[in-house]
């Protein structure tokens, strides 16, 4: 079975479906946010270009003990072709800029929605 986004499915999930599910999860996070997301944890900003799924995961994986983004971390791992572990850094990180997880999620969501609308799924 393929497990993407935490859901078991009878076969590979189409990229457009996987991206839609990731977007819906990010929407869910932003809409259900009451207290500061992940206690206001800061993460490295990333360049929203090719390879950004791995870069996003590399940033978010360094946030521990935040259940609100665990599903997002799992879903992002489905878009990243290599294994990502804490402390790993990509050239796509804007290494001099840290932002709150809430802002990171908002920026990522906006970009992913536009990729979905433009049919760019990989």
């Amino acid at each position: 079975l393929t497990c993407l986004g935490g859901f078991a499915s009878p076969g590979p999930v189409p990229p457009s479906t996987a991206l839609r599910e990731l977007i819906e999860e990010l929407v869910n996070i932003t809409q259900n946010q009451k207290a500061p997301l992940c206690n206001g944890s800061m993460v490295w900003s990333i360049n929203l270009t090719a390879g950004m799924y791995c870069a996003a995961l590399e940033s978010l994986i360094n946030v521990s003990g935040c259940s609100a983004i665990e599903k997002t971390q799992r879903m992002l791992s489905g878009f990243c072709p290599h294994k990502v572990s804490a402390g790993q850094f990509s050239s796509l990180h804007v290494r001099d800029t840290k932002i709150e997880v809430a802002q990171f999620v908002k920026d990522l969501l906006l970009h992913l929605k536009k990729l979905f609308r433009e049919g760019q799924f990989n």
Epitope: P14, L19, R20, L110, H111, K113, K114, F116, R117, G119
Partner: antibody, heavy 120, light 112 residues
Amino acid sequence: EVQLVESGGGLVQPGGSLRLSCAASGFNIKDTYIHWVRQAPGKGLEWIGRIDPANDNIKYDPKFQGRFTISADNAKNSLYLQMNSLRAEDTAVYYCARSEENWYDFFDYWGQGTLVTVSS
Amino acid sequence: DIQMTQSPSSLSASVGDRVTITCRSSQSIVHSNGNTYLEWYQQKPGKAPKLLIYKVSNRFSGVPSRFSGSGSGTDFTLTISSLQPEDFATYYCFQGSHIPYTFGGGTKVEIK
């Protein structure tokens, strides 16, 4: 309140240039796409092109590519349509419109339009 | 480019009539994300267009239930179940699936 207000229309001679503006308020233009649409007198609607102000990704109908240029100024929350080598057939009301902000499925807000008349 | 062909180009009808406008695309307008970005806009003289229907059959907020959309693939329909005086206007279909996006030629609904 979301608003789009076009300006810059007027009378221009054939071969001349004009720059239209679209001032947006009530939302951040970087959060959506902005489109330019025109309508010649008594005719139908024509899509000119659109811009993603977040990254300046611009798409045109090929018939306008080269003569028309879409741009954005995020600091001013404004959009522009630069029109060069104007012809009589470019006479039209020019509208800017935004894609709705959730999934960009449709145009939910339009400006009132600005009339461009190309005539000698 | 995808051509959107509307028919009829104009029609005369009375208040209370059921009105059907069709729109045919020159090729499929199913987007690669699975959505069909087919919209219907209403325009009155001197005014900007207003959205009625999006993604083939979804009524925009505030649009009366007498307006409905249907279709798939390349053939689409806007139906006004019972024409009201404020419905006399020009209607345009629009495809936002493939760039360049394109409008239909319009259908003018006039009073009989």
